[in-house]
């Protein structure tokens, strides 16, 4: 008799793929055209990335550092109208993209919550949640919660409102903290909260250190669903050396949890790489005309258009990973086991029941390394075969689909491999 299938876990929509943050509408759409109506025209692009949710805004009225001129219920007319927002929601829904609204109050100001002492604004967030839930949003994000007095109790209240409306709604909180204890204490009072933090960016970017960070985080958070990012708002390029971008994309897409990216991460957009750009919100490089002020400042391989035409580009890698992440059971909700490998490497396996299994091997080092995979510390349910098929490499030169002998596996500097192998009873 065939072994009995393992019961599938309950899957919420944010478990099924990546979230994509657009914190600045104008910068995302390019010069002078940043509004909600224009964003509607970019939904096909988001569909091509296979992201499951769009974290948008803030969009509300906010005069820098002025509580009285901040209205969480009103869209800033510069971004469009409530009608434009409703239209965007409808269009996103048709494309199966969920919309999460950022309600961080003082987004134009220095302190995102005005000051630690101000709690009248936090009191009103609950009304805003109800208003925007009625309007049809799929969830909310609030950032810099370490600057909010009684953050845990406010988050608990906001989560109750969000989940009370529907279990299918999501609350994301962001913190600049990289301290695991602080992160865990924020998570403790909120069972379904997704928390983005600077935890992974507090790293020396070595295989051993990253492995230790990930395993400590997973151990500390128990069996709750995690999110993975390097910060609550910034671009990957702001935290990572360029040579590790591909490696981190592979890692973020294959760790157990929801990967969260910022617009431009998929093309390696750099903060303030071009003159006159704001550091926190660089203009998205759609094509070579994205930066008309300085002719020749943008080359094709920096843009969405150029990278879309190049199968070896970062954007192509992102799309491939996103596709795998959203359809493979082992990557969707599979068990996660790390195991010993060569120094400088971080290796793990993702497996679910009798489904195809995935092996991830990441070389953080500047030199080529032998993988040295040692499966002795893996449970019997997750043993390694002698060969696995290459799904993708972060570096050019390997043939996708080719079988690789795991004992002889060697990785190039900064190379990451995603390999698959079948379940054997």
């Amino acid at each position: 008799r065939a072994p009995r299938c393992r019961e599938l876990p309950a899957q919420k929509w944010w478990h099924t793929g990546a979230l994509y943050r657009i914190g600045d509408l104008q910068a995302f759409q390019g010069h002078g055209s940043g509004n909600l109506a224009g964003l509607k025209g970019r939904l096909d692009y988001l569909s091509s990335l296979k992201v499951k949710g769009l974290v948008l805004g803030p969009l509300h009225k906010n005069q820098k550092d002025d509580v009285a001129q901040t209205d969480l219920l009103q869209i800033d007319p510069n971004f469009g109208s409530k009608e434009d927002f409703d239209n965007l929601l409808q269009s996103a829904k048709k494309k199966s993209i969920r919309v999460i609204l950022d309600l961080t109050p003082n987004y134009r100001g220095e302190n995102l919550w005005f000051s630690t002492q101000v709690d009248s604004v936090a009191t009103k967030v609950k009304d805003a949640l109800e208003f925007w839930l009625q309007a049809g949003v799929d969830g909310f994000q609030v950032r810099d919660i370490e600057n909010l007095k009684d953050a845990s109790s406010f988050l608990a209240e906001w989560e109750n409102i969000t989940k009370g409306f529907s279990e299918d709604r999501l609350l994301i909180a962001g913190t600049n903290s990289s301290d695991l204890q602080q992160i865990v204490s924020l998570l403790e009072s909120n069972k379904d909260l997704l928390l983005t933090s600077s935890y992974l960016s507090d790293s020396s970017f070595t295989g051993e250190h990253t492995k230790s960070l990930v395993t400590q985080y997973l151990n500390a958070t128990g069996n709750r669903w995690c999110s993975w990012s390097l910060s609550q708002a910034g671009l990957l390029t702001s935290f990572l050396p360029a040579q590790l971008l591909r490696l981190y994309q592979l890692m973020l897409f294959t760790l157990p949890g929801t990967p969260v990216f910022s617009y431009g991460d998929e093309i390696g957009l750099k903060a303030a790489a071009l003159p006159g750009q704001p550091v926190e919100a660089p203009v998205m490089l759609w094509d070579e005309s994205s930066f008309p002020d300085i002719p020749g400042a943008v080359s094709a391989n920096m843009t969405v258009k150029g990278q879309s035409e190049d199968p070896g580009s970062l954007l192509s890698l992102f799309r491939q990973l996103s596709d795998q992440r959203s359809k493979e059971r082992s990557l969707l909700h599979g068990d996660f086991h790390t195991f010993s490998s060569g120094p400088g490497l971080f290796s793990y396996i993702r497996h679910w029941d009798q489904n195809e299994r995935f092996l991830v091997v990441l070389n953080f080092g500047d030199v080529g390394l032998s993988a040295g995979l040692q499966a002795s510390d893996l449970p019997a349910s997750a043993s390694l075969p002698t060969k696995a098929d290459l799904v993708l490499s972060t570096q050019p030169g390997r043939e996708e689909g080719s079988p690789l002998e795991l004992e002889r596996l060697k990785l190039e500097p900064h190379e990451g491999l995603l390999l698959r192998f079948p379940y054997v009873a």
């Epitope: 009285a68 005005f114 002492q117 101000v118 709690d119 009248s120 009304d127 109800e130």
Partner: antibody
């Protein structure tokens, strides 16, 4: 220009419930916060609470056990009920729009609690 | 609750003078303070919000200042129509609270 007008009985007996309605004209009651404030004779102003059009409320803890504020968006009205009144509840009652501070006010209505 | 104290119940001034009404918060309220003018038989009228911003249509002889716990409403070149009671209000925390008021009398 938003205008507000309070209406309701000017005299209420002790232990009964005070009921007032505020009609908003010149603007929609949706997407704003609507408050009740009172001023007892010779005293300062006291915020009673607010309602938002979803029905979400926030009350002054000193009155919370006795206060109910409700909204009727179809009539562009919101209402105040204050139960178990005593002579200390005698005051001019104002309705107002709140944007943390109060930018539009009704004229106010004097409610006397007396047998 | 945050207590807003207006220690002067009455202030006397002459037309053309400059007068300052003060208000003290029992804890730090940042700049989250508004000022109102109230005349007998009328509802209060917003003058100042965020401690220093004049509400639309308010004459520029009214200015607000202060932050933290100490706030001042200054009326320069006092006019006879400024005869009224002035209240401060904090909106840093709920419940929203008002000062007890300062009555301005014209000599």
């Amino acid at each position: 220009q938003v205008q507000l007008q309070e209406s309701g009985p000017g005299l209420v007996k002790p232990s009964e419930t005070l009921s007032l309605t505020c009609t908003v004209s010149g603007g929609s009651i949706s997407s704003s916060y609507w408050s009740w404030i009172r001023q007892p004779p010779g005293k300062g102003l006291e915020w009673i609470g607010y309602i938002y059009n979803s029905g979400s409320t926030n009350y002054n803890p000193s009155l919370k056990s006795r206060v109910t504020i409700s909204v009727d968006t179809s009539k562009n009205q919101f209402s105040l009920k204050l139960s178990s009144v005593t002579a200390a509840d005698t005051a001019v009652y104002y309705c107002a729009r709140e944007t943390y501070y109060f930018d539009y006010w009704g004229q106010g209505t004097l409610v006397t609690v007396s047998s | 609750d945050i207590v807003m104290t207006q220690s002067q119940k009455f202030m006397s001034t002459s037309v053309g003078d400059r007068v300052s009404v003060t208000c003290k918060a029992s804890q730090n309220v940042g700049i989250n303070v508004a000022w109102y003018q109230k005349k007998p038989g009328q509802p209060p009228k917003a003058l100042i919000y965020s401690a220093a911003y004049r509400y639309s249509g308010v004459p520029d002889r009214f200015t607000g200042s202060g932050s933290g716990t100490d706030f001042t409403l200054t009326i320069s070149n006092v006019q006879s129509e400024d005869l009224a009671e002035y209240f401060c209000q904090q909106y840093n925390s709920y419940p929203l609270t008002f000062g007890s008021g300062t009555k301005l009398e014209i000599k």
